[in-house]
């Protein structure tokens, strides 16, 4: 058993049917010595008397808010949450597995640049009695500061019969140098509590590996005289690290017909313009990627050919 | 159709072309190592990220773009002295800081070259003959060092009398390649920045 925060305790259980559970001793936070009784949640049934209460915690019915009283007056509370260990591995019931890039990927994180600012998000099908708390650091043995905001509900979507809720959090490394070569990963820890169930989720990454630039901006077409060709031009996204000659991007220009089945023409360039053939009803899209370290491509920025 | 990327004119800044080749070569070598050594801890998540140049060179700081020198988090100044007679900038004026930056890059390359050559000698003794260093990568390191053209004492190749532990050597190879790839990215960024200056 360990303290999550004041008066909130987590009981770790090896979780399987008919498991013996854990014996827990609760102590009433009071100078009083006698006349103390204990109750659980809203029930008025007296579970025991005395300054301490010993309970066998096996199932969720044994968790909850234990209160000690004296003469009708509340002396203190202890909220017990359960953390299930299933075959040696902590349970992951609260969050939805995003399964990308591998099974048991619950947290996904992205950074728009090398400033040390990043966003993480996760999914759940649970809509009520749910709280999250996020902590982060650079490295774990001698952690350096990363400040995270509060997790907020960022999207709701319907998936089949289920509603899916997306939560996200923004974090900023306290003293980040965009040009630094990372040797210690960023660690993100999310505590999740649903009713009386506690779970924790972690993700470890280097900022360089979660970079996903914003799409190129100001995408424009300039028809070339007496030709079906057009000059496509664009600019670096505002959110990208500067100077651009140091933090360079590479670009992919795509000409896509109206039908998804039509052949796509693609050109790769380090410049911020390209000459392509603009077909009728086609659209031109451009996306960006770090020129020197191949992390994710940005989303596409698109303009119609007409 | 996939059209090739147009490469910038290497005449503008001879080192830019070499540094791009370096990044390509080390990335290919790292990919090859990860595939060949799939039963060894060779992924970014599994290895310890060690920097053999730590406390010996300060490439990131010495080569910091002017725009980032206002960022206090980037000014982790280290006292390191460098030889300052680089010729990479051809006819351009080589400022003291630029020479410091380029000589730091040269020292990095020299250190990695020695480590890789020592390691290759060990790997050649491995009866499994599982993996060797790509000669192209070693050649590209050499070319960039020649383009940088710094005079510096030759570091003797480390020789070891004891029987090599091939498992440890292969893990060390992975660690070195990961670190060298990150340094190659920095070198490429620096050359691109200097080319634009």
């Amino acid at each position: 058993i360990w303290e999550l925060k004041k008066d909130v305790y987590v009981v770790e259980l090896d979780w399987y049917p008919d498991a013996p559970g854990e014996m827990v001793v609760l102590t009433c936070d009071t100078p009083e010595e006698d006349g103390i009784t204990w109750t659980l949640d809203q029930s008025s049934e007296v579970l025991g008397s005395g300054k301490t209460l010993t309970i066998q915690v096996k199932e969720f019915g044994d968790a909850g808010q234990y209160t000690c009283h004296k003469g009708g007056e509340v002396l203190s509370h202890s909220l017990l949450l359960l953390h299930k260990k299933e075959d040696g591995i902590w349970s992951t019931d609260i969050l939805k597995d995003q399964k990308e890039p591998k099974n048991k990927t619950f947290l996904r994180c992205e950074a728009k640049n090398y400033s040390g600012r990043f966003t993480c998000w996760w999914l759940t099908t649970i809509s009520t009695d749910l709280t999250f708390s996020v902590k982060s650091s650079r490295g774990s043995s001698d952690p350096q500061g990363v400040t995270c905001g509060a997790a907020t509900l960022s999207a709701e979507r319907v998936r089949g019969d289920n509603k899916e809720y997306e939560y996200s959090v923004e974090c900023q490394e306290d003293s980040a140098c965009p040009a630094a070569e990372e040797s210690l990963p960023i660690e993100v820890m999310v505590d999740a509590v649903h009713k009386l169930k506690y779970e924790n989720y972690t993700s470890s990454f280097f900022i360089r590996d979660i970079i996903k630039p914003d799409p190129p901006k100001n995408l424009q077409l300039k028809p070339l005289k007496n030709s079906r060709q057009v000059e496509v031009s664009w600019e670096y996204p505002d959110t990208w690290s500067t100077p651009h000659s140091y933090f360079s991007l590479t670009f992919c220009v795509q000409v896509q017909g109206k039908s998804k089945r039509e052949k796509k023409d693609r050109v790769f360039t380090d410049k911020t313009s390209a000459t392509v053939i603009c077909r009728k009803n086609a659209s031109i899209s451009v996306r960006a990627q770090d020129r020197y370290y191949s992390s994710s491509w940005s989303e596409w920025a698109s303009v119609p050919c007409s | 159709r996939n059209l090739p990327v147009a490469t910038p004119d290497p005449g503008m800044f001879p080192c830019l072309h070499h540094s791009q080749n370096l990044l390509r070569a080390v990335s290919n070598m790292l990919q090859k190592a990860r595939q060949t050594l799939e039963f060894y801890p060779c992924t970014s998540e599994e290895i310890d990220h060690e920097d053999i140049t730590k406390d010996k060179t300060s490439t990131v700081e010495a080569c910091l773009p002017l725009e980032l020198t206002k960022n206090e988090s980037c000014l982790n100044s280290r006292e390191t002295s460098f030889i300052t007679n680089g010729s990479c900038l051809a006819s351009r004026k080589t400022s003291f800081m630029m020479a410091l930056c380029l000589s730091s890059i040269y020292e990095d390359l020299k250190m990695y070259q020695v480590e890789f050559k020592t390691m290759n000698a060990k790997l050649l003794m491995d009866p499994k003959r599982q993996i060797f260093l790509d000669q192209n990568m070693l050649a590209v390191i050499d070319e960039l060092m020649q383009a940088l053209n710094f005079n510096s004492e030759t570091v003797p190749q480390k020789s070891s009398l004891e029987e090599p532990d091939f498992y440890k050597t292969k893990i060390k190879l992975c660690i070195l390649l990961h670190a060298f790839r990150i340094r190659a990215v920095t070198i490429d960024r620096v050359m691109s920045y200097l080319n634009a200056s």
Epitope: Y16, K102, K104 | -
Partner: antibody
Framework: QVQLVESGGGVVQPGRSLRLSCAAS????????MHWVRQAPGKGLEWVAF????????YYADSVKGRFTISRDNSKNTLYLQMNSLRAEDTAVYYC????????WGQGTMVTVSS | QSVLTQPPSVSGAPGQRVTISCSGS????????VKWYQQLPGTAPKLLIY???QRPSGVPDRFSGSKSGTSASLAITGLQAEDEADYYC????????????FGTGTKVTVLA
Amino acid sequence: QVQLVESGGGVVQPGRSLRLSCAASGFTFSSYGMHWVRQAPGKGLEWVAFIEVDGSNKYYADSVKGRFTISRDNSKNTLYLQMNSLRAEDTAVYYCKTHGSHDNWGQGTMVTVSS
Amino acid sequence: QSVLTQPPSVSGAPGQRVTISCSGSRSNIGSNTVKWYQQLPGTAPKLLIYYNDQRPSGVPDRFSGSKSGTSASLAITGLQAEDEADYYCQSYDRYTHPALLFGTGTKVTVLA
């Protein structure tokens, strides 16, 4: 005590479907993840699928992905395996089992896919 | 295709000690716990060992498990006729968890 009873097995032609059930009793079914495991005649054990407590996370072996669907009805204390596009190589005894360091297995139900 | 390798068969006379090995890799046995099951003909597998070396109540102390690096082993001391069965190791892989990874299985024969 904990009991798991599989049913729904039988002989079926290739390409057809079958739905297996696993009735659970003696424990709080809704609190435990559940697996399906199969064993072809004379062969070893092969994991098929897993479902977490509320059914939001499901996992499948590559050999059955896209053809089999694991589901559960916690109000009925029952685990299901919907098997579509059955093949001869799906012939096996199918077991359901609880997830945990101490697990409980059903007695198994035989599925034979044959023309 | 199982990635946990066991010998197809082992045999011993009554009273002897036999061991069954289970060989994996860093991503499975190297990073997860191991279980051992006994399966008698026509019956469901029965748990013998969990958490590498722990015996559930009711399992005789003749059965013991151990794990070292990327391999695990099950030892049966004082072999008895009723120990003749198939034995399977089981673990997880850190990349595919919660998929159960079973060993190839070992037939233990008690020599008359």
